[in-house]
Interface confidence: medium
Amino acid sequence: EEELQIIQPDKSVSVAAGESAILHCTITSLFPVGPIQWFRGAGPARVLIYNQRQGPFPRVTTVSETTKRENMDFSISISNITPADAGTYYCIKFRKGSPDTEFKSGAGTELSVRAKPS
């Protein structure tokens, strides 16, 4: 069984205020079973940005069809970016359980927000 890797290829992404940011994340294995979640920041103060199993998350859409069982692309698009969205975003795989437990994290993608062009 292939070891799960969580691939966040962008070390950083820069987006102008008001635009959408695409944050890439793919996984290399369907195991263990469990959802993908996106967070901004790390540690106890981190903020949930997207959870595959709950919602809605009005500004967040998935780039591919995450409901398909064989899907391995969990990239997200965040619309109408504001300076408050700046930070490092982590794509994290959880192992299914009661409750789900964090299994593995991507390396993170730092989102910086540029001033809206005048």
Partner: antibody, heavy 119, light 108 residues
Framework: DVQLVESGGGVVRPGESLRLSCAAS????????MNWVRQAPGEGLEWVSL????????YYADSVKGRFTISRDNSKNTLYLQMNSLRAEDTAVYYC????????????WGLGTLVTVSS | ETVLTQSPGTLTLSPGERATLSCRAS??????LAWYQEKPGQAPRLLIY???SRATGVPDRFSGSGSGTEFTLTISSLQSEDFAVYYC??????????FGGGTKVEIK
């Protein structure tokens, strides 16, 4: 100017060990992920290993996993590759390569150091 | 692991001619693709990143195009210093970071 200078190559017998070094200058070494890439005689480029700027994240190619160890000393601006249990197929020029700060491509390379494994 | 296939293996052309090098990925790498030039006794040199962005100091006769699985490096008018081996590298699916097998551009 960014400079990467590899050293430590040489001729060894199968099963022996070698430690390669890469001295870096011209950039803030600790801020950049670093890689080793090799090229066997007459062959293409093969990625070997990656280490993050802090040294906390490390990856290896399957072909060297368990035999090679990448490390870095940020106080000395130096990258290392400890190569154990060397095999004939490890014969190659080993390049030290600096990653771009945003993406995982290599914006600067050293000239390489030749490792020959032969009985 | 994403496999990159470069073609042709060797391209034999005269100075002034146009060179078109191909790199095909076994799965989509979006535009996370770089091209390098390698000459004997020299360090490999980054030419193109992001499939189409020229690295600093690279002459504008070098251009890259493509996305997904099909990529092209074009040298619009070959100069004597362009005869070398060229490699593509994907940096979307990692580890491992993978390279193509290379295309040698040699003088006719």
């Amino acid at each position: 100017d960014v400079q990467l200078v590899e050293s430590g190559g040489g001729v060894v017998r199968p099963g022996e060990s070698l430690r390669l070094s890469c001295a870096a200058s011209g950039f803030t070494f600790s801020s950049y992920d670093m890689n080793w890439v090799r090229q066997a005689p007459g062959e293409g480029l093969e990625w070997v290993s990656l280490i993050s700027g802090s040294g906390e994240i490390i990856y290896y190619a399957d072909s060297v996993k368990g035999r090679f160890t990448i490390s870095r000393d940020n106080s000395k601006n130096t990258l290392y590759l400890q190569m154990n249990s060397l095999r004939a197929e490890d014969t190659a020029v080993y390049y030290c390569a600096k990653e771009n700060n945003r993406y995982r491509f290599f914006d600067y390379w050293g000239l390489g150091t030749l490792v020959t494994v032969s009985s | 692991e994403t496999v990159l296939t470069q073609s042709p293996g060797t391209l034999t052309l005269s100075p002034g001619e146009r060179a078109t090098l191909s790199c095909r990925a076994s799965q989509s790498v979006y535009t996370y693709l770089a091209w390098y030039q390698e000459k004997p006794g020299q360090a490999p040199r980054l030419l193109i990143y992001g499939a189409s962005s020229r690295a600093t100091g690279v002459p504008d006769r070098f251009s890259g195009s493509g996305s997904g699985t099909e990529f092209t490096l074009t040298i619009s008018s070959l100069q004597s210093e362009d005869f070398a081996v060229y490699y593509c590298q994907q940096y979307y699916d990692r580890p491992p970071l993978t390279f193509g097998g290379g295309t040698k551009v040699e003088i006719k």
